[in-house]
């Protein structure tokens, strides 16, 4: 982790002041994946490259933040820079982040991830949602998403809200949730694996 953030910062620091402003304005209108909010205009326009990098990572996390940055750079005509950013981001990204067990061979086969296969059961049966949120915060959940899930009144509605963000996740992000579930409610995961 940190590689994507450094690559974003390197790109933004190489823009002129006027290009950085152009970047911010385009960021205000760039299409976003479902479940992600916009950085407020007032805050955005007052940021320097370092502040903006940190905000991009806290709002969109490293991988999507880098993808979004590359999209905006491309829209500004900076195709080569966008390519360099994505190349830097993808270097070494084949390995799962530290602390994540590699998925079992069955999960590596094409098809649905465990958490997608058992979505309905997880919504109905997960009770320790707060623990999951803490485990996912800053890794796959932005501050805004974290707060949105916590604001829900019941565990099923919390889980439903959490699942509303998963379409934007890759396999590794879903593995993080699975790992958190194994640690907090291992019996539930084992039960679902047997079913």
């Amino acid at each position: 982790m940190g590689r994507a953030r450094d690559a974003i910062l390197d790109a933004l620091e190489n823009l002129t002041a006027e290009e950085l402003k152009k970047f911010k304005l385009k960021l205000l209108s760039v299409p976003l994946r479902e479940g992600y909010g916009r950085i407020p205009r007032g805050a955005l326009l007052s940021m320097d490259a370092l502040d903006l990098t940190d905000k991009l990572v806290s709002f969109y996390l490293e991988t999507y933040g880098a993808e979004l940055t590359a999209n905006v750079l491309r829209d500004m005509g900076l195709q080569e820079m966008a390519g360099q950013l994505q190349a830097a981001t993808h270097q070494g990204s084949g390995a799962a982040p530290a602390g994540i067990q590699a998925p079992p061979q069955s999960a590596a086969k094409p098809g649905l991830h465990f958490i997608d296969q058992h979505r309905a059961a997880l919504i109905a049966r997960v009770t320790n949602v707060e623990w999951l949120l803490d485990a996912l915060y800053g890794k796959v959940l932005t501050d805004e998403q974290y707060q949105a899930v916590r604001a829900e009144p019941t565990n099923p509605s919390k889980m439903r809200k959490l699942f509303s963000f998963t379409p934007a996740w890759n396999w590794t992000c879903k593995d993080l949730l699975l790992q958190a579930l194994r640690e907090s409610q291992s019996y539930l995961v084992e039960d679902l694996e047997r079913s």
Partner: antibody, heavy 117, light 112 residues
């Protein structure tokens, strides 16, 4: 239509200050940088500085640091340039220009400042 | 500070002629990451505001006639007018924005 309207000509005494305005229409100044450029009679263009109206951040050419001050009033979509401790060397036309991220694509008509006792 | 040098300081031409003027910077204006040269060309007619012709050394501003061409990279740049018209008589300034902003002293284009 994008326009930058500058204040009228000014005749000022040595040692005094002058405040020039540049009012934008057709765009929001917060979305751009506004630059100021000085041109003395029969001379070339000299960059004074730039302001980011969204946050008030400024950059000046070192020779105008302390001499010129740029401020912004977003409510009226206006940027101001104040030039202080005027001498005959400050007699010039001052232009404001909009930088849209590519370059200075629109300019005001210029304000003539004459310093004379 | 980046110093911009323009040559010649003045140029007398006849209508229809091809003209070239040059601009040199004291350091490279090429940003290796953005691959852009932060050099622009402006035209200023007497009593008027400057008008942007070319930015990023070679990109013609929309609406500028294609007889105006910018070229060069790094420290050496050229503005070419392929067939000079009477309305092209003006002073031409190059300007760097790689580090803050500096204008060249200008090249005055006059009728022979």
């Amino acid at each position: 239509e994008v326009q930058l309207q500058q204040s009228g000509a000014d005749l000022v005494k040595p040692g005094a200050s002058v405040k020039l305005s540049c009012t934008a229409s057709g765009f929001n100044i917060e979305d751009t940088y506004i630059h100021w450029v000085k041109q003395r009679p029969a001379r070339g263009l000299e960059w004074v500085g730039r302001i980011d109206p969204a946050n008030g951040n400024t950059d000046y050419d070192p020779k105008f640091q302390g001499k010129a001050t740029m401020i912004t009033d977003t409510s009226s979509n206006t940027v101001y340039l104040q030039v202080s401790s005027l001498t005959s060397e400050d007699t010039a036309v001052y232009f404001c220009g909009r930088h849209d991220g590519y370059d200075m694509d629109y300019w005001g008509q210029g304000t003539s400042v004459t310093v004379s006792s | 500070d980046i110093v911009m040098s323009q040559s010649p300081s003045s140029l007398a031409v006849s209508a229809g002629e091809k003209v070239t003027m040059s601009c040199q910077s004291s350091q490279s204006l090429l940003n290796g990451r953005t691959r852009r040269n932060y050099l622009a060309w402006y035209q200023q007619k007497p009593g008027q505001s400057p008008k942007l012709l070319i930015y990023w050394a070679s990109t013609r501003k929309s609406g500028v006639p294609d007889r105006f061409t910018g070229s060069g990279s790094g420290t050496d740049f050229t503005l070419t007018i392929t067939s000079v018209q009477a309305e092209d008589l003006a002073v031409y300034y190059c300007k760097q924005s790689y580090n803050l902003v500096t204008f060249g002293a200008g090249t005055k284009l006059e009728l022979k």
